[in-house]
C-alpha cells in the first residue's frame, strides 16, 4: 500500500505538505512490538494506558494493570516479574545520555493489588531489572549494584566502590554506552537467575570534557564527563559474576581476560549467557581489528570461572576493522557450545556461520553478494534472520527462515511476497520457542505490524495498520520516491531521489543532497517517512537526493572498508560524483545545488562545500565533527587508528574541516550546534568558526543553548524553520 498519488481530477482537493505538518508530527506512524511473556502471551500498553495481556491461542485479552494504578504513581513504563507476582512501575523519567536515564520505581503486588511497603527502593535508580525466573531484583543506585531476593526484602549490596564519574558498576560510562555496548545497562542475569554478571568501568584516568550548562541560574553549571577522545586514556573494564542465591558466600568472582587481549589496551564488547554455568564474553583489542570470543565455565569446586584457551575464538580483519559497526554477537544452539555468528566470508560479504569447534572450521550457512544483517532466533529446527538478498536491493530487509534440522538446510523468505509494494523493510520479534512472531514493516508504504504463527508463518492478525495516517494522507500531495543505482568506476552508488509531486523531467529543479555517510551506515533504505525533506519536495519543489557511497554498509567489505584509516575522503568524493551524475540527468538546475547533514553528515557536508568543485551554492552542517581528534576514542580509532606519529596522525590532521577554511569563501555556509552536546562537542563548531573568522570568510551560524546532539523540543522547530529560510534564500524561492 502506497499513500495515494496525485490524479488530475483531484488536484483541487489535494494539498502540499507544510512545514507545520512536519513540526507537529501530523504524519507520524505507529509500530506494535509485543512484550512477550510466554510462547503465546504478550503484554501491550493500550492507548488509554491500561496494561493488557493478550493470549493468542484463545484470542482473549485481560487488563492486568489499570490506568488508575499507573496514574497513581505517574508511571510511564512497567515491567512484569517473570513469576507474574509483581510489576515495577517507572516514573520521574530523567534522560541522561542516548540510552541512559534515571527513574523512580514502585513495586506493585498483583496478589493483593497493593504497592509493596517497607524496604522501598531508593531514588533515583540508574537501572533496574527482574531476574529471568521468579522475582529477584537487581538495580544500580549511585553507581553500585544491589540485589533483592524478593521486592519486599532488604537489599544486598554487591559493590561498594561506585563513585560518580570514577567507577561505574552495572552501568556503562559515556563511551561504552554510546560506542560499544550500546545500552544503558552493563549487567546480565544467567538464564535461570542463579548468577548475575556485571561490568565495572574505571574512568579515573580518563580526561574530562567540561562544558557550561546555562540553565536559569546566575552562574552556569559545568557538566563534567569522563570522555576519552582519540588517543586518550580509555576506561579500564573488569567483568565479575556473583552467585545470587548465596551472594555473601564467595562474593563477586572476576572473569579472566584472554592473554592475547590483556597484553595491551582492550575493550569488553558483550556478554552472552549460554546456560546458568556457561558464559560467553567478547573482547576487542584497542586497535579494533582483533576480537576474541571466550567461553567460560563455572568451576563448582573453586567457585570460579574458567576460560580455557581451547574455548577462545579469534575474529580478525586484515582489510579493515572487526565486524560491521559492532562485532556481531553469537547466538548459541541447544547443545550450549556451538553457535551461529555473522562475520565476513572469503568473498568479503557478512554472512551467517556455524561454529562448532574453531572459527577456521566454521560452516557457512548463507552466501552470496548480499549480506545477512541480524540473527533473530535459533530454535531446534529453524534459524530466523534478516538480509538484503531479495531482488538485489541493499536497502531492503526481509526475514528468512532456514531449516537447520534437515540436510541440506532449506531456506524460505517469510516476508518477500507478503505485501510486496507496501513492505520491503522488516524487523521481527519472536515469542518463546518462536511459537509466534510479530513482523514490523517500516515501508516503503505506510508501516504495518502483523502477528504470525511461528510454524506455518500464517498471518493471524494485524496489530497496527496506521489507518488514521492513511486517511490523513489521502488529500496530501506527497513527493515521489525512487531508489536506483549509479555505476561509477567499479563502484555502485545507490541513491534515493525524492521528487516534487508534479515532477517534469523537462524542467529544472533545485537539488538538495542530504548526507550522513558514516562508516557502516545506510541512508538509502526502503522505508516510509514524511519528514522535512518530504516537505521541501512537496511544497518547495526541490529535488532531494541521498547517496550511499564508500564506507556505507551491507554491500560487502570492499565498499565498507574503503574508508579505513582515511575518513573524510571517499565519502565526500562519492557525494560529488553522484551530484555530477544527477546534473547529467538533465532536470537539475546546476546553479542551485545545496548539501546538508547532521553529525557525521555535517562533517561530510562541510568537506563537500569546501571541496573547491564549485558544485554547491550553499550548505548546512548541524552538529558536525570538525576534527577526528575531538571525537570519541572507541568510534574514531575503529576507523582511523591512533593519532600518533607512528600510526595515523597525518591523516587526522589532513582530514579536518578547519584545514579547508579558505575554500568556504565561495559558498554560503550555515553552521549549527547545541552548546550542551555531550556527543559531538560544541568545540567542533567553535573551531570551525574560529578558523573561518581567522581566514576572514563570511558564514552564518546558529547555536542552541543547553541543547544536546539531538536538538530536541522547541529547538527542533526553530532549527527546521531556520534551515528552511536559509535554503529558500539560497535557491531564490519566495517566502
Amino acid at each position: 500500500l502506497r499513500p495515494s498519488r496525485v490524479h488530475n481530477s483531484e488536484e483541487n482537493t489535494m494539498r502540499a505538505l507544510t512545514l507545520k505538518d512536519i513540526l507537529n508530527g501530523t504524519f507520524s506512524y505507529k509500530t506494535f512490538f509485543p512484550n512477550w511473556i510466554s510462547g503465546q502471551e504478550y503484554l501491550h500498553q493500550s492507548a488509554d494506558n491500561n496494561i493488557v495481556l493478550y493470549n493468542i491461542e484463545t484470542g482473549q485479552s485481560y487488563t492486568i494493570l489499570s490506568n488508575r494504578t499507573m496514574k497513581s504513581v505517574n508511571a510511564s513504563n512497567y515491567g512484569l516479574s517473570p513469576d507474574r507476582q509483581f510489576v515495577y512501575l517507572e516514573s520521574d523519567y530523567s534522560k541522561l545520555w542516548r540510552y541512559s536515564y534515571t527513574a523512580t520505581y514502585y513495586i506493585y503486588d498483583l496478589s493483593n493489588g497493593e504497592f509493596v511497603r517497607g524496604n522501598e527502593l531508593p531514588r533515583p535508580i540508574q537501572y533496574l531489572c527482574w531476574s529471568p525466573v521468579g522475582s529477584k531484583l537487581a538495580y544500580v543506585y549511585q553507581n553500585n549494584i544491589y540485589l533483592k531476593q524478593r521486592p519486599g526484602d532488604p537489599p544486598f549490596q554487591i559493590t561498594f566502590n561506585g563513585r560518580e564519574n570514577k567507577i561505574f558498576n552495572g552501568i556503562p560510562d559515556w563511551v561504552y554506552e554510546e560506542e560499544m555496548l550500546p545500552t544503558k545497562y552493563a549487567l546480565w542475569w544467567s538464564p535461570n537467575g542463579k548468577f548475575l554478571a556485571y561490568a565495572e568501568f574505571n574512568d579515573k584516568d580518563i580526561p574530562v570534557i567540561a562544558y557550561s550548562y546555562y540553565g536559569d541560574e546566575q552562574y552556569p553549571r559545568t557538566i563534567n564527563i569522563p570522555y576519552p577522545k582519540a588517543g586518550a586514556k580509555n576506561p579500564v573494564v573488569r567483568i565479575f559474576i556473583i552467585d545470587t542465591t548465596y551472594p555473601a558466600y564467595v562474593g563477586p568472582q572476576e572473569v579472566p581476560v584472554p592473554a592475547m587481549i590483556a597484553s595491551s589496551d582492550y575493550y569488553f564488547s558483550w556478554l552472552t549467557w549460554v546456560t546458568d554455568e556457561r558464559v560467553c564474553l567478547q573482547w576487542l583489542k584497542r586497535v579494533q581489528n582483533v576480537s576474541v570470543l571466550s567461553i567460560c565455565d563455572f568451576r563448582e569446586d573453586w567457585q570460579t570461572w574458567d576460560c580455557p584457551k581451547t574455548q577462545e575464538h579469534i575474529e580478525e580483519s586484515r582489510t579493515g576493522w572487526a565486524g560491521g559497526f559492532f562485532v556481531s554477537r553469537p547466538v548459541f544452539s541447544y547443545d550450549a557450545i556451538s553457535y551461529y555468528k555473522i562475520f565476513s566470508d572469503k568473498d568479503g560479504y557478512k554472512h551467517i556461520h556455524y561454529i562448532k569447534d574453531t572459527v577456521e572450521n566454521a560452516i557457512q550457512i548463507t552466501s552470496g553478494k548480499w549480506e545477512a544483517i541480524n540473527i533473530f532466533r535459533v530454535t531446534q529446527d529453524s534459524l530466523f534472520y534478516s538480509s538484503n538478498e531479495f531482488e538485489e536491493y541493499p536497502g531492503r530487509r526481509n526475514i528468512y527462515r532456514i531449516s537447520i534440522g534437515s540436510y541440506p538446510p532449506s531456506k524460505k523468505c517469510v516476508t518477500c511476497h507478503l505485501r510486496k509494494e507496501r513492505c520491503q523493510y522488516y524487523t521481527a520479534s519472536f515469542s518463546d520457542y518462536a511459537k509466534y512472531y510479530a513482523l514490523v514493516c517500516y515501508g516503503p508504504g505506510i508501516p504495518i505490524s502483523t502477528l504470525h504463527d511461528g510454524r506455518t508463518d500464517q498471518e493471524i492478525k494485524i496489530l497496527e495498520e496506521n489507518k488514521e495516517l492513511e486517511n490523513a494522507l489521502k488529500n496530501i500531495q506527497l513527493p515521489k520516491e525512487e531508489i536506483k543505482k549509479l555505476e561509477v568506476d567499479e563502484i555502485t552508488l545507490w541513491y534515493k531521489m525524492i521528487l516534487p509531486p508534479q515532477f517534469d523531467r523537462s524542467k529544472k529543479y533545485p537539488l538538495l543532497i542530504q548526507v550522513y555517510g558514516g562508516p557502516c551506515s545506510q541512508s538509502v533504505r526502503s522505508v516510509f517517512a514524511v519528514n522535512w525533506i518530504s516537505y521541501l519536495a512537496s511544497k518547495e519543489g526541490m529535488v532531494i537526493a541521498l547517496v550511499d557511497g564508500r564506507g556505507t554498509a551491507f554491500q560487502g567489505d570492499k565498499l565498507l572498508y574503503a574508508v579505513y584509516r582515511k575518513l573524510g575522503v571517499y565519502e565526500v568524493e562519492d557525494q560529488i560524483t553522484a551530484v555530477r551524475k544527477f546534473i547529467e540527468m538533465g532536470f537539475i538546475d546546476e546553479k542551485r545545488i545545496a548539501i546538508w547533514g547532521w553529525s557525521y553528515g555535517g562533517y561530510v557536508s562541510s568537506l563537500a562545500l569546501a571541496s573547491g568543485t564549485g558544485l554547491f551554492k550553499c550548505g548546512i552542517a548541524v552538529a558536525p565533527v570538525s576534527s577526528w581528534e575531538y571525537y570519541a576514542s572507541v568510534y574514531t580509532e575503529r576507523f582511523m587508528g591512533l593519532p600518533t606519529k607512528d600510526d595515523n596522525l597525518e591523516h587526522y590532521k589532513n582530514s579536518t574541516v578547519m584545514a579547508r577554511a579558505e575554500y568556504f569563501r565561495n559558498v554560503d555556509y550555515l553552521l549549527i550546534h547545541g552548546t550542551a552536546d555531550d556527543n559531538v562537542h560544541f568545540q567542533n563548531s567553535a573551531q570551525i568558526a574560529k578558523a573561518l573568522v581567522n581566514a576572514q570568510v563570511d558564514f552564518q551560524a546558529m547555536w542552541y543553548s543547553d541543547q544536546n546532539h539531538g536538538l530536541s523540543g522547541l529547538s527542533t522547530n526553530h532549527l527546521y524553520t531556520h534551515m528552511t529560510h536559509f535554503l529558500k534564500q539560497c535557491f531564490s524561492l519566495s517566502d
Epitope: 485481560y62 507474574r84 507476582q85 496478589s111
Partner: nanobody
Framework: QVQLQESGGGLVQPGGSLRLSCAAS????????MGWFRQAAGKERELVAA???????LYADNVKGRFTISRDNARNTVYLLSNSLKPEDTAVYYC?????????????????WGQGTQVTVSS
Amino acid sequence: QVQLQESGGGLVQPGGSLRLSCAASGRTFGSYAMGWFRQAAGKERELVAAISAGGSTLYADNVKGRFTISRDNARNTVYLLSNSLKPEDTAVYYCAARRGSAYYTNHIDWPYWGQGTQVTVSS
C-alpha cells in the same frame, strides 16, 4: 495436592444469571490462586476469571462487568457469578488451581482441575 469439584451449571436464558461454585479439598486452599476456565465446542480452553491468594482478580475483557469471581477461604470455595449471560457464554466451565500468581492465562500453567460443569445459554 488439591481436589476440585464444580457445581451450579445448567440451562439459562440469554440475559439470565448463574452462580458456579467450586469446592476444594486441602488445608492450604488459601494459598492457591484459583481460576475459572471455559471450553466451548471446537475451541481452546480459555481463562474467564482468576483470583489470587491475596484476593486480587483478573477477568477476560469480554466478561468484565458481567462476571464476578470471589472466594471464601473458610469454606474452601471459589465462586463465579455470571450475569447478563449471552449464547456465546455457552461452554463447559472448569475450576482450576495453582500455586503462585493468578495471572496465567494458558491452561497448561494450571496443574489442578475439576471435572467441569456445563453452562448452556439458550432461549
